[in-house]
Interface confidence: medium
């Protein structure tokens, strides 16, 4: 009888990550009696993938019942393939021995290549917000793809960007690869609604690239412009002063009124109006009882926006022309005599 041969008909198998790989192996004879084992790699450092006789291999199933006496099909399926599974797999026939089985013959090997999709690109912007006219860097990362060839593009609101640098690692052979790209974007005042998009194209994506986005609303800080105006007198001895806070983003803003340098009232922007460009406007008013002042009053609207140093705008209120009202010591509604911004 012809000596048993171990046949691995496929020199290579290409499988997409997440799918199941079928590694085919047949024997030409039932003799000698003995188990089959599958290994990844050859030599002393080879990795046991499946042992017919013992062990627990949850990802591996056999194509046929290896316990059948007449079985000569030793093919296996490996489920949920990842790039780490890439390598050359050997089907090895053992001869029953005592006390241990003895390796009898090996197949020629099947190279398993894993075609892995890149992970969804993750775009991250700068840690701190920046103001218009500044250039900020965005990074895009995608991992775990194979083969190495990949294309990455950057867009801002649909317009392709050209100022970026891209690296694919590692440079040498690997089971999977990562791409890292950094793009430079110049912010404009209209960018609150803008998006930066990183687009990755790979053979595994079948012409449908993956995209990662970053909203510039998380990156941009548009500082407010302030305008303090004096409204017509609402009642005798009362003047309404408004502070218009315009075109700011994000919304987090705190406003303090000061009368001659003393804190009168502090409030947090709440009921804001949104502009078409995504920035906000807000108005605060102060009702001043001019009869409480002998001299002119310097009213200051001081705004702390998004944790930045306060900006302010002042307005000089002339009170000399107004009659004095006896017994009044209230300078403004909700005023306190606190100093040093204490509430």
């Amino acid at each position: 009888e012809e000596e048993l041969q171990v046949i691995q008909p496929d020199k290579s198998v290409l499988v997409a990550a997440g799918e199941t790989a079928t590694l085919r192996c047949t024997a030409t004879s039932l003799i000698p009696v003995g188990p089959i084992q599958w290994f990844r790699g050859a030599g002393p450092g080879r990795e046991l993938i499946y042992n017919q006789k013992e062990g627990h291999f949850p990802r591996v199933t056999t194509v046929s019942d290896l316990t059948k006496r007449n079985n000569m099909d030793f093919s296996i399926r490996i489920g949920n393939i990842t790039p780490a599974d890439a390598g050359t797999y050997y089907c090895v026939k053992f001869r029953k021995g005592s006390p241990d089985d003895v390796e009898f013959k090996s197949g020629a090997g099947t190279e398993l290549s894993v075609r892995a999709k890149p992970s969804a690109p993750v775009v991250s912007g700068p840690a701190a917000r920046a103001t218009p006219q500044h250039t900020v860097s965005f990074t895009c990362e995608s991992h775990g793809f194979s083969p190495r060839d990949i294309t990455l593009k950057w867009f801002k609101n649909g317009n392709e960007l050209s100022d970026f640098q891209t690296n694919v690692d590692p440079v040498g052979e690997s089971v999977s690869y990562s791409i890292h790209s950094t793009a430079k974007v110049v912010l404009t005042r209209e960018d609150v609604h803008s998006q930066v998009i990183c687009e990755v194209a790979h053979v595994t994506l079948q012409g449908d690239p993956l995209r990662g986005t970053a909203n510039l609303s998380e990156t941009i800080r548009v500082p407010p412009t302030l305008e303090v105006t004096q409204q017509p007198v609402r009642a005798e001895n009362q003047v309404n002063v408004t502070c218009q806070v315009r075109k700011f983003y994000p919304q987090r803003l705190q406003l303090t009124w000061l009368e001659n340098g003393n804190v009168s009232r502090t409030e947090t922007a709440s009921t804001v109006t949104e502009n078409k460009d995504g920035t906000y406007n807000w108005m605060s008013w102060l009702l001043v009882n001019v009869s409480a002042h002998r001299d002119d009053v310097k009213l200051t609207c001081q705004v702390e926006h998004d944790g930045q140093p306060a900006v302010s705008k002042s307005h000089d209120l002339k009170v000399s022309a107004h009659p004095k009202e006896q017994g009044s010591n209230t300078a403004a509604e909700n005023t306190g005599s606190n100093e040093r911004n204490i509430y």
Partner: antibody, heavy 122, light 107 residues
């Protein structure tokens, strides 16, 4: 690691004073707003006072305004609460707490000290 | 001042149960709401910030949701180590205010 350690609590008579301290380590103290929060025995949490990173903005609960003074020494990585005109209702465990986000306040308190007990009783 | 109404004030549930705590603000506070856990004799611990974001290192069985005035805190599967009092906290305006707390016990 980030750590806050309070000290200075104790027994004091009504009308008396105490100064609580909070020693900070493991983070850039000068970049963070800080807070004092107290908890009366068997009761819930009550915010007491907050101070911004540069100490230009200070806030107090109405219940302590005019009696308590919050301050900080960024060079010493320390936060303080000077408590004057103490009342029985000020009896509580006092916690110092770090703001979650640097330079700005209003994001919450992500690190707390173990607390120091203040008892006001005659 | 913004009042934070937390309910229930206490609850008893079995290990593995889903536990829900609500917090209602007396006015719109957007998402400026945090949830804290306090175990007996210990300092509070931040669990959820900005209404729904899980603080680093906090088990994923804890979650939060809501915006405006109505907020919910959930423990998807109660564990023995979750015995504690839970507080909501608003940060929309000073004074910062806390809910009255919810004491969670194991049946």
């Amino acid at each position: 690691q980030v750590q806050l350690v309070e000290s200075g609590g104790g027994l004091v008579k009504p009308g008396g004073s105490l100064r609580l301290s909070c020693a900070a380590s493991g983070f850039t103290f000068s970049s963070y707003s800080m807070h004092w929060v107290r908890q009366a025995p068997g009761k819930g949490l009550e915010w007491v006072s907050s101070i911004s990173s540069s100490d230009s903005w200070i806030y107090y609960a109405d219940s302590v305004k005019g009696r308590f003074t919050i301050s900080r020494d960024n060079a010493k990585n320390s936060l303080y609460l000077q408590m004057d005109s103490l009342r029985a209702e000020d009896t509580a465990v006092y916690y110092c707490a770090k703001e979650r986000v640097d330079y700005w306040h209003g994001y919450g308190m992500d690190v707390w000290g173990q607390g120091t007990t203040v008892t006001v009783s005659s | 001042d913004i009042q934070m109404t937390q309910s229930p004030s206490s609850l008893s549930a079995s290990v593995g149960d889903r536990v829900t705590i609500t917090c209602q603000a007396s006015q719109d506070i957007s998402n400026y709401l945090n949830w804290y856990q306090q175990k007996p004799g210990k300092a509070p611990k931040l669990l959820i910030y900005d209404a729904s974001n899980l603080e680093t290192g906090v088990p994923s069985r804890f979650s939060g949701s809501g915006s405006g005035t109505d907020f919910t805190f959930t423990i998807s599967s109660l564990q023995p180590e979750d015995i504690a009092t839970y507080y909501c906290q608003q940060l929309s305006n000073y004074p910062i205010t806390f809910g009255g707390g919810t004491k969670v016990e194991i049946k």
